[in-house]
């Protein structure tokens, strides 16, 4: 008598999540009499997937009618496949008895589930950095299968090369996750820049998923400060201007100091944006020269985005020989960031 064979013709089957999977199994003989059962996995922890005789298996249906005489096809169809269904499925023949006795197992069919990666999420650094510094961006995507996946980074459409990518777990799993960290060198022009993480996977049919992050969230462009005298007015008042240019973000506080004493504090708000995304701000201070007998030291103090304050100072020298009213005085830059204004006294 020929020995019974349990034939599982496919070593592996790959199915897209949501689809149905067909697991084929035929037996070479009708004898001995006894049921076929399907298991996922082997050993004492194996799970019963289908048993024609008893049990409720709502997602599993036999491919051919198991009740018809001389049936030797015990293939099953599992509907609405999810990544959790991945594993090795065994078709097992039992000999009828009390209880039934396991007789022969098929070689097993490995079911792998193709699952799309989640939309990539890109996160930037927790604190802002200035131009010429390198910042890290992280891209994460989860839940995909099979493990093979391609991830690319772009900055304003240009592909980046300085990144490290890990796919976890290392071994076989129902689904996988990818995490990549890219290093980006900032420039002052990056306020409007964007980094893009692009993920390509077999389940996406050539239409990769993208995640983006704006460098505006990561960059700080410190301001340039320039202090100038606008004019000497007829009433002996000097108009001093502090020009704060090319800064980002907008969060900025400006304080005028006269001889070290706070004169006025202002907060930047609702400023118009430059083409490059940075901001400019101008503040004026009127100094009554005739009210002072000694030189006046004016300081424009700017605190930007919580950083240490930056100062620019002027010395207004009170002279016995006033200059012609209405003329602009050229500000002479000294080595200490002080500018000298010679204002007339009368």
């Amino acid at each position: 008598e020929e020995e019974l064979q349990v034939i599982q013709p496919e070593k592996s089957v790959s199915v897209a999540a949501g689809d149905s999977a067909t697991l084929n199994c035929t037996v070479s003989s009708l004898i001995p009499v006894g049921p076929i059962q399907w298991f996922r996995g082997a050993g004492p922890g194996r799970e019963l997937i289908y048993n024609l005789k008893e049990g409720h298996f709502p997602r599993v249906t036999p491919v051919s009618d198991p009740t018809k005489r001389n049936n030797m096809d015990f293939s099953i169809r599992i509907s609405n496949i999810t990544p959790a269904d991945a594993g090795t499925y065994y078709c097992v023949k039992f000999r009828k008895g009390s209880p039934d006795v396991e007789l022969k197992s098929g070689a097993g069919t490995e079911l792998s589930v193709r699952a799309k990666p989640s939309a990539p999420v890109v996160s930037g650094p927790a604190v802002r950095a200035t131009a010429e510094h390198t910042v890290s961006f992280t891209c994460e995507s989860h839940g995909f299968s099979p493990r093979d996946i391609t991830l690319k980074w772009f900055k304003n459409g240009n592909e980046l090369s300085d990144f490290q990518t890990n796919v976890d777990p290392a071994g076989k799993s129902v689904s996988y996750s990818i995490r990549s960290t890219a290093r980006v060198v900032l420039t002052r022009r990056d306020v409007h820049s964007q980094v893009i993480c692009e993920v390509a996977h077999v389940t996406l049919q050539g239409d990769p998923l993208r995640g983006t992050a704006n460098l505006s969230e990561a960059i700080r462009v410190p301001p340039f400060l320039e202090v100038t005298q606008q004019s000497m007015r007829a009433d002996n008042q000097v108009n001093v201007t502090c020009q704060v240019t090319k800064f980002y973000p907008q969060r900025l506080q400006l304080t005028w100091l006269e001889n070290g004493n706070v004169s006025r504090t202002e907060m930047a708000s609702a400023l118009p944006e430059n083409k490059d995304g940075t901001y400019n701000w101008t503040s004026w201070l009127l100094v009554n020269v005739s009210a002072h007998r000694d030189d006046v030291k004016l300081t424009c103090q700017v605190e930007h985005d919580g950083q240490p304050a930056v100062n620019k100072s002027f010395s207004v020298k009170v002279s016995a020989h006033p200059k012609e009213q209405g003329s602009n005085t050229a500000a002479e830059n000294t080595g200490t960031n002080e500018r000298n204004i010679y204002g007339g006294s009368g």
Partner: antibody, heavy 122, light 112 residues
Framework: QVQLQESGPGLVKPSETLSLTCTVS????????WSWIRQPPGKGLEWIGF???????FYQSSLKSRVTISLDTSKNQFSLKMTSVTAADTAVYYC????????????????WGQGTTVTVSS | DIVMTQSPLSLPVTPGEPASISCRSS???????????LDWYLQRPGQSPQLLIY???SRASGVPDRFSGSGSGTDFTLKISRVEAEDVGVFYC?????????FGQGTKVEIK
């Protein structure tokens, strides 16, 4: 080449909980059983229990009330927790991989960690 | 629980000579599928055990062919055709038919 590495404290006080972790590198958690086996000084091998990749656990009946084996597939690790330890729990603890090809039984414990010595003493 | 009993417990050997270890189980390890759930392990001094034989007679990967396993049901034998110096250590048989997995007491093989 699959490798297993046990980690955890070498000294545990009586009545406290012993916690060991086994890290699996170079291979997959799936389709295998992950076992803890111990060997008291100068004695033979004693199986503590194992966990299948699907999360099903099996324990030595005499230890069942004190032992928990868990699996973290994202980290490729599995762990042993043993409560209320006594001096009799002093042993070298091995983590190991057990194969299963088909059928109800198993096909050999084919990969072993190097073992970690745990001493129960106050 | 299935009880595994080994003999002898100590085995002095001569390099180049054959050696044999017996293992008996308290119930049959031959499953209805025809598979025998009996394994053999070697634990060299200061090392972890290593799998030599599984399924009663199948050699594990990388195991020299001087090791062979035989037997069926409840009586099993591990044979070393020509003992080498590196074969010293403790040999264990173990059953993998049902939980709890159980091991024999071990047979200590040492050079005469």
């Amino acid at each position: 080449q699959v490798q297993l590495q046990e980690s955890g404290p070498g000294l545990v006080k009586p009545s406290e909980t012993l916690s060991l972790t086994c890290t699996v590198s170079g291979g997959s958690i799936r389709d295998y059983y992950w076992s803890w086996i111990r060997q008291p000084p100068g004695k033979g091998l004693e199986w503590i229990g194992f966990i299948y990749y699907n999360g099903r656990t099996f324990y030595q009946s005499s230890l069942k009330s004190r032992v928990t084996i868990s699996l973290d597939t994202s980290k490729n690790q599995f762990s042993l927790k043993m409560t209320s330890v006594t001096a009799a729990d002093t042993a070298v603890y091995y983590c190991a991989r057990v194969r299963a090809y088909s059928g109800i039984g198993l096909d050999g414990t084919d990969v072993w960690g190097q073992g970690t010595t745990v001493t129960v003493s106050s | 629980d299935i009880v595994m009993t080994q003999s002898p417990l100590s085995l002095p050997v001569t390099p180049g000579e054959p050696a044999s270890i017996s293992c008996r189980s308290s119930q049959s390890l031959l499953y209805s599928t025809g598979y025998t759930y009996l394994d053999w392990y070697l634990q060299r001094p200061g090392q972890s055990p290593q799998l030599l034989i599984y399924g009663g007679s199948s050699r594990a990967s990388g195991v020299p062919d001087r090791f062979s396993g035989s037997g069926s049901g409840t009586d099993f034998t591990l044979k070393i055709s020509r003992v080498e110096a590196e074969d010293v250590g403790v040999f264990y048989c173990g059953q993998a038919l049902q939980t709890p997995l159980t091991f024999g007491q071990g047979t200590k093989v040492e050079i005469k």
